[in-house]
Interface confidence: medium
């Protein structure tokens, strides 16, 4: 599973992220969620096969033909800045659900450049598909400096 480690958008814009997966995950459910703790995720959005799923301002759609699923976050706000996760292939770990394949994305949101005028057509940031190893440093140090290492992380679902 591959994707960008960081994404950035402006308030009011839409942002799309493309998560690429291997052929063997073609029929598996695809997930997007906001990471609370290393093993804990909230605001989970799931899609099956090529169906589109929507929750609030988040839409997730699988494209099995080109082995990607796309997550679109609409009308970004400053409070959307957080750590998120793309994931596939749910298995049972130690009595709780967890993802076999996953990667984390640090989403930053900046104020819009022209807060006075009402926004026109929403801008969509380019879909980024930076190739990352499933294991290995995904984010590096956070600006707050609290994270010594930050690996692509598994999690447990509620």
């Amino acid at each position: 599973l591959h994707g960008p480690s960081t994404m950035s958008g402006s308030v009011g814009e839409s942002l799309s992220v493309s998560c690429r997966y291997e052929e063997k995950f073609k029929t598996k459910d695809k997930y997007w969620c906001r990471v609370s703790l290393k093993i804990l995720c909230k605001d989970i959005v799931k899609t099956s096969s090529s169906e589109e799923a929507r929750s609030g301002r988040v839409t997730i759609r699988d494209h099995p033909d080109n082995l990607t699923f796309t997550v679109t976050y609409e009308s970004l706000t400053l409070e959307d800045a957080d750590t998120y996760m793309c994931a596939v292939d749910i298995s049972l770990f130690d009595g709780s659900l967890g993802f076999d394949k996953y990667f984390k994305i640090e989403l930053s949101v900046v104020p819009s450049e022209d807060p006075v005028s009402s926004p026109g057509p929403t801008l969509e940031t380019p879909v980024v598909s930076t190739s990352l190893p499933t294991k290995g440093p995904a984010l590096g140090s956070n600006t707050e400096g609290h994270r010594e290492h930050d690996y692509s992380q598994g999690l447990r679902l509620p």
Epitope: I39, L40, F93, D94, K135, G154
Partner: antibody, heavy 117, light 108 residues
Amino acid sequence: EVKLVESGPGILQPSQTLSLTCTFSGFSLSTYGMGVGWIRQPSGKGLEWLANIWWDDDKYYNPSLKNRLTISKDTSNNQAFLKITNVDTADTATYYCARPTTEGDYWGQGVMVTVSS
Amino acid sequence: QFVLTQPNSVSTNLGSTVKLSCKRSTGNIGSNYVNWYQQHEGRSPTTMIYRDDKRPDGVPDRFSGSIDRSSNSALLTINNVQTEDEADYFCQSYSSGMYIFGGGTKLN
């Protein structure tokens, strides 16, 4: 049954390094999803989270104390460790280790540490 | 980084209902899970509510958790308050892998 037991020096002097050990049973830090954290509580005051370490050796620290904290683990002996350098009287507290889970945290009984000259 | 604010103390009567609040300073209270811990004098904290509103086995159903988005707060409600409920209550949430604790409420 999950059990966590903290141990430490009891008392130490300012500027020394505090070394704490959490010995646990009922889970393994080599298992996917497992972690151990440290929290402290000065007498009569609130809880302050210090650090977490996870099965894959990922480490998280309280940013206000990060330059003084080192968390580590010994998976084979079911132990986690926390070192706090250059201690001061403000570090006097009960120190807890805890196992984070998706159903809240399991806490040890805590160990009292006094920093006094 | 946000702060969780709790009232220092709350007094109530035996058998009544009490609500303890935990207000998030910035960002949405619903963005990250909230846990509630009870701590009796001289004891270690125990989980009363996890993931906003879920109760661990063994915790009486008098205890419930909820999210109040209008006040950007988490709430711990205790119905039919008993003498053994007198304790300190701490809320806790998460921020990018870190724990954030509220200052605690002493329930008298």
